[in-house]
Amino acid sequence: TQHGIRLPLRSGLGGAPLGLRLPRETDEEPEEPGRRGSFVEMVDNLRGKSGQGYYVEMTVGSPPQTLNILVDTGSSNFAVGAAPHPFLHRYYQRQLSSTYRDLRKGVYVPYTQGKWEGELGTDLVSIPHGPNVTVRANIAAITESDKFFINGSNWEGILGLAYAEIARPDDSLEPFFDSLVKQTHVPNLFSLQLCGAGFPLNQSEVLASVGGSMIIGGIDHSLYTGSLWYTPIRREWYYEVIIVRVEINGQDLKMDCKEYNYDKSIVDSGTTNLRLPKKVFEAAVKSIKAASSTEKFPDGFWLGEQLVCWQAGTTPWNIFPVISLYLMGEVTNQSFRITILPQQYLRPVEDVATSQDDCYKFAISQSSTGTVMGAVIMEGFYVVFDRARKRIGFAVSACHVHDEFRTAAVEGPFVTLDMEDCGYNIPQTDESTLMTGRA
């Protein structure tokens, strides 16, 4: 939900067609009753389209009105279209809901590239392919927007899953997940498996496909392989974490680790790209260019503006390096690394001119607001947002796209000293200068 290529996110298919799935490994962590195991009813409850966001079906009001809602860990408002809009097939009609309550308050939310405003109220909300509960939640009824809704995306609202600190108009507006936990017995955690397709999807393919899973209140073993590794949530506003080291094909970028987290590093399902602070982006691109120098790409490609295409099935994945981010671990002086493949950071797009080619955009971009671990990162991993224990877990996703030579990885432990020094302390400024997630 940060800036850059935000909100509009990309998704894809789950299941076998996604490419090779890794075999399950035994889970070394002890069971935590009520939080781990099988959540069959929630598996495969996300859909989406490359670059346009992963969404879950929700119902709002009485009688229930069904809407598709973008899952966004980079913002904290639950907001739905509530007026006709050219890009919406349907919208929330408050006047038809007997349980709607007007909060008599307006709200305005600017993202980097989109904005909306609306009126606050509360209503009964449930997630059909989620926990079997109904909660009264705050809802922003969007009455006016600019570059927010996306033509053909098939979602009509946004579910901000981050913390109250970044809710608009202020932190007194309780976010949906807080209401859910407070009003039910759902444990205070959720997990996301976002499944990139590895190839572009047309409208009908998206509607027929699975884009992943949002497991509310728990962890599903079938969605990941190997072990879960946890990094502390540094501060409960965005899902802020600390990156302590970055490697391209095993080569350390050798920057002051504060640069990696300037001015923050967040995990954001509502952003398409891996977004990096200017200095880090420049160093990373330089290193990726060097590693892939057997082929030359135009500058526009590295800026995320131009496609590169190869004849179908001939994409030279092997010339592109893997990227490893080392995250602060739960134990003092201990870190772990998550490694993504070019299959994650080269985003498949449809080439208008020739459908015989496989075309891609470079999905790493520059940020002025810190590191954003968007879909490019998340599509490689099963990500556990363990709010109860103030930590985020990463494991290799059972649906990540890879080839026969390399897979995404989560590995540790590594010894890393003085990791606390890697965090950047944002000077206290007026809260009103905060940009809410998305772009």
Epitope: R104, K105, G106, E117, E119, E144, P169, S432
Partner: antibody, heavy 124, light 107 residues
Framework: EVQLLESGGGLVQPGGSLRLSCAAS????????MGWVRQAPGKGLEWVSA????????YYADSVKGRFTISRDNSKNTLYLQMNSLRAEDTAVYYC?????????????????WGQGTLVTVSS | EIVLTQSPATLSLSPGERATLSCRAS??????LAWYQQKPGQAPRLLIY???NRATGIPARFSGSGSGTDFTLTISSLEPEDFAVYYC?????????FGGGTKVEIK
């Protein structure tokens, strides 16, 4: 220079209707929220209604809800206030005001300048 | 409804003096509060928005402060043209409401 010129005021009987207009110039009308504020003779100010730039967001004071309708014609750079079922307490000078942005609820998006007003008198 | 109470109702001061006008909200309006000035026979004009930001073209002698429920408009040194009625207004909650006004008159 921004200009806002209200018209359509006058004397009307209780229960009657009037339509106020506000002709705007000197700025991109469609990219600004617009509003109506009224002031009864010798009294303070009261917000009546406001609309966002495209007309998606609309605000009404409780005292006029269901009786007054705000609308805008962005092709004519004109804001309207249709007032039905008028009451004696609606007697006031009605000011048209320009918003600070297209948004109705954005911080910083306050209303300024205002027109010189048009007097509406509801009396039998 | 949020009630804005302005005090004093009238402030009698001489040019060059400092004027301090108060606006108290019946519940928090965060920083969604503005101040307008109105002279006889004229439309109001915006002085301060979002509690403390000076509107375009407003002299530096006007300043606003406060958040939540207590707000102050200060005119550091009154000029002859500053004698007028001052209104605070909130847009935090519906209905948007004005205070009753403070009249600053020449002593």
């Amino acid at each position: 220079e921004v200009q806002l010129l209200e018209s359509g005021g006058g004397l009307v009987q209780p229960g009657g209707s009037l339509r106020l207009s506000c002709a705007a110039s000197g700025f991109t009308f469609s990219s600004r929220a617009m509003g109506w504020v009224r002031q009864a003779p010798g009294k303070g100010l009261e917000w009546v209604s406001a609309t966002s730039g495209s007309g998606g967001s609309i605000y009404y004071a409780d005292s006029v809800k269901g009786r007054f309708t705000i609308s805008r014609d962005n092709s004519k750079n004109t804001l309207y206030l249709q007032m039905n079922s008028l009451r004696a307490e609606d007697t006031a000078v009605y000011y048209c005001a320009k918003g600070g942005s297209q948004w109705l609820y954005a911080p910083g998006s306050w209303f300024d300048p205002w027109g010189q007003g048009t007097l509406v008198t509801v009396s039998s | 409804e949020i009630v804005l109470t302005q005090s004093p109702a009238t402030l009698s001061l001489s040019p060059g003096e400092r004027a301090t006008l108060s606006c108290r909200a019946s519940q928090s309006v965060s920083s969604y509060l503005a101040w307008y000035q109105q002279k006889p026979g004229q439309a109001p004009r915006l002085l301060i928005y979002d509690a403390s930001n000076r509107a375009t073209g407003i002299p530096a002698r006007f300043s606003g402060s406060g958040s939540g429920t207590d707000f102050t408009l200060t005119i550091s040194s009154l000029e002859p043209e500053d004698f007028a009625v001052y209104y605070c207004v909130q847009r935090s909650n519906f209905p948007w409401t004005f205070g009753g006004g403070t009249k600053v008159e020449i002593k």
